[in-house]
């Protein structure tokens, strides 16, 4: 296999080094010579030639491959020209010769992938590997190839990407950047507790790679899919030179699904305890897990220990809404929260679903606000509400919805950020239901919508009443 990797090497005498502390040279002979016909001699400048012990391998339909592995590490020196020549013992001929630098003929052994598992975000994959020669790992660059493992389609798309060592894993993006605040104050963020449609980039095939030493994070994969992956390495071309080594044996990994599919929502009411809920699946049991991480980049050789999220009684508040599973745990405000839901189906198959990580201050759910009203004139209402959390008044936005009695459709209004009330024009002599909800959406705190307030029934007066 290694021979094919050296195919571009036009030299008849091919040499490679696995670790830059070893050297193997070989060449092929078509003619049927006796064993012991050839000597591979080598010499460094101003030194006496020495013979390298040869072994031979018969090659069907071709001839013989002669191989020499340099016997002594001390004979393998970097940055000095090494003169090699093949001498025929029986005939007066030098079969081939070349001068090389050991530091330019690297052919690294493939790294062994020791772990491949889902990363901290849906569609991420964390891999780590061991370098057979750790002392040279700083002088190697790595290439990863991977693709979906589809038994029906063995020729699925294969992605080959150079692993960039300059950066670590992408730091967790806080969902609310400045640009998010330029939108309407209550614009729906892409958050871990959102159960709306998943926002994806135009192409999920274009995936990103980053690495640090022996670990790497791939993103942009399809959650819930299986993938195979392989690694190989080559000298960096700066300190050491050579060729790409062979690919490692393929490793397969099943990525957890995206918990958005389960409608996962997590929130805190008190910045201490976190509650998560998700839709209960038919004929299946489920369990939530969590862990906290401080890491802003790839944890090297560190894999999370998932803790049990304490289960709550299943709720079914209304016949229209699906049944939810709920669990809760104590959290911290100095670390990122990761959520995993495991669904076990009746035959015992376990499916994992990963939520998008979040900080506790990104999942603050406000209590349901109280709505007060009075009719100023016929159909003209003045509305007022208390901020559920005075400490975050300027970061609280509201939605008011109302509907005429007997109607199904609701009209939704969004008062300005931080408003404590407003006015509403309704038809006189009509009956309405009004509801209010609140959520945090500022630079410090964010979170999901509170539940709607209990419907407030309003019957507007006739036009002569006021």
């Amino acid at each position: 296999q290694d021979v094919s990797l050296l195919a571009s090497d036009s030299e008849p005498l091919k040499c490679f080094s696995r670790t830059f502390e070893d050297l193997t040279c070989f060449w092929d002979e078509e003619e049927a010579a006796p064993s012991g016909t050839y000597q591979l001699l080598y010499a460094y400048p101003r030194e006496k030639p020495r013979a390298c012990p040869l072994s031979s391998q018969s090659m069907p339909h071709f001839g013989t491959r002669y191989v020499c592995q340099f016997p002594d590490q001390e004979e393998v020196r970097l940055f000095f020209p090494l003169h090699l020549w093949v001498k025929n013992v029986f005939l007066n001929q030098t079969r081939t010769q070349r001068v090389l630098f050991v530091d330019s003929v690297g052919l690294p052994a493939p790294p062994s992938i020791i772990k491949a598992m889902g990363g901290s975000q849906p569609g991420e994959l964390q891999i780590s590997w061991e370098e057979p020669a750790p002392e040279i790992s700083d002088f190697l660059r790595y290439e990863l190839r991977y693709g979906p493992r589809d038994p029906k389609n063995s020729t699925g798309p294969t992605v080959i990407q150079l692993i960039a060592t300059e950066t670590c894993c992408p730091a967790l993006q806080r969902p609310h950047s400045a640009s998010a605040l330029d939108q309407s104050p209550c614009a729906q963020p892409t958050m871990p507790w959102q159960d709306g449609p998943k926002q994806t980039s135009p192409s999920r095939e274009a995936s990103a790679l980053t690495a640090e030493g022996g670990s790497c994070l791939i993103s942009g994969l399809q959650p819930g899919n299986s993938y195979w992956l392989q690694l190989r390495s080559e000298p960096d071309g700066i300190s050491l030179g050579g060729s790409w080594g062979s690919w490692s044996l393929p490793v397969t990994v099943d990525l957890p699904g995206d918990a958005v599919a389960l409608g996962l929502q997590c929130f805190t009411l008190d910045l201490k305890n976190v509650t998560c809920q998700w839709q209960q699946q038919d004929h299946a049991s489920s369990q939530g897990f969590f862990y906290h991480s401080r890491a802003r980049c790839c944890p090297r050789d560190r894999y999370p220990i998932w803790e049990n999220c304490e289960e709550e009684e299943k709720t079914n508040p209304g016949l229209q809404t699906p049944q939810f599973s709920r669990c809760h745990f104590k959290s911290r405000n100095d670390s990122i929260i990761h959520i995993l839901v495991e669904v076990t189906t009746a035959p015992g198959t376990v499916h994992s679903y990963l939520g998008s990580p979040f900080w506790i201050h990104q999942a603050v759910r406000l209590p349901t606000p109280n709505l007060h009203w009075r009719e100023i004139s016929s159909g003209h209402l003045e509305l007022e509400w208390q901020h559920p959390s005075s400490w975050a008044a300027q970061e609280t936005c509201y939605q008011l919805r109302y509907t005429g009695e007997g109607h199904q459709d609701w009209k939704v209004l969004e008062p300005p950020l931080g408003a404590r009330g407003g006015t509403l024009e309704l038809r006189p002599r009509s009956r309405y239901r009004l509801q209010l909800r609140a959520r945090l959406n500022g630079p410090t705190y964010q979170g999901p919508w509170s539940s709607w307030s209990d419907p407030t029934r309003v019957e507007t007066a006739t036009e002569t009443a006021w």
Epitope: E31, A33, P34, S35, S58, F90, L91, N92
Partner: antibody
Framework: DVQLQESGPGLVKPSQSLSLTCTVT?????????WNWIRQFPGNKLEWMGY???????SYNPSLKSRNSITRDTSKNQFFLQLNSVTTEDTATYYC???????????WGQGTSVTVSS | DIQMTQSSSSFSVSLGDRVTITCMAS??????LAWYQQKPGNAPRLLIS???SLETGVPSRFSGSGSGKDYTLSITSLQTEDVGTYYC?????????FGGGTKLEI
């Protein structure tokens, strides 16, 4: 054309040494190739005894238990076989031959018959 | 040492016959096999190298085949001048060794 010619005593006493000469004409033994001694016993069995290469390195058949030695005289373009402590078992026809490009004996002398007897 | 065995020490043949002489090595010799012909009172003459390669000047009725441990010399239509003893020789591993010979007699 390359020619090889063996010469030496036809009769040798047991325990003595046997010395044979191979004279090569038409090619310099130091230029190239490997120069061999082979013997054929009365029952026609052939045995390779050893060689000397163009560069002067030698190799021997271990069955002769270090009794033989191959040397050369480059000025005369000759190479020699010396077999020590001979016994009647060493009675044979002795050939010199050249190992050619294909590592086979492509040129042979006509052979010299040696009898070991008291 | 590698032993070379020629199973038939002699053959009684007729002119025009197809003759096959076999040679077996005690281990794989990777086609490092030569065939020699020797006529009475003469030195051996090289016929074939590397199991199958015919030497210059050798009639095309001679051919060699085989690999691994088993090798064959074939003469398609025996001529009078082909009478003699045929030897195989391995040159894979030192010491180089010969077969016991196969004598062809009319």
């Amino acid at each position: 054309d390359v020619q090889l010619q063996e010469s030496g005593p036809g009769l040798v006493k047991p325990s003595q040494s046997l010395s044979l000469t191979c004279t090569v004409t038409g090619y310099s033994i130091t230029s190239d190739y490997t120069w061999n001694w082979i013997r054929q016993f009365p029952g026609n069995k052939l045995e390779w005894m050893g060689y000397i290469t163009y560069s002067g390195s030698t190799s021997y058949n271990p069955s002769l238990k270090s009794r033989n030695s191959i040397t050369r005289d480059t000025s005369k373009n000759q190479f020699f076989l010396q077999l020590n402590s001979v016994t009647t078992e060493d009675t044979a026809t002795y050939y010199c031959a050249r190992l050619g490009r294909r590592y086979t004996m492509d040129y042979w002398g006509q052979g010299t018959s040696v009898t070991v007897s008291s | 040492d590698i032993q070379m065995t020629q199973s038939s020490s002699s053959f009684s043949v007729s002119l025009g016959d197809r003759v096959t002489i076999t040679c077996m090595a005690s281990e794989d010799i990777y086609i490092r096999l030569a065939w020699y012909q020797q006529k009475p009172g003469n030195a051996p003459r090289l016929l074939i190298s590397a199991a199958t390669s015919l030497e210059t000047g050798v009639p095309s009725r001679f051919s060699g085949s085989g690999s691994g441990k088993d090798y064959t010399l074939s003469i398609t239509s025996l001529q009078t001048e082909d009478v003699g003893t045929y030897y195989c020789q391995q040159y894979w591993s030192s010491p180089w060794t010969f077969g016991g010979g196969t004598k062809l007699e009319i």
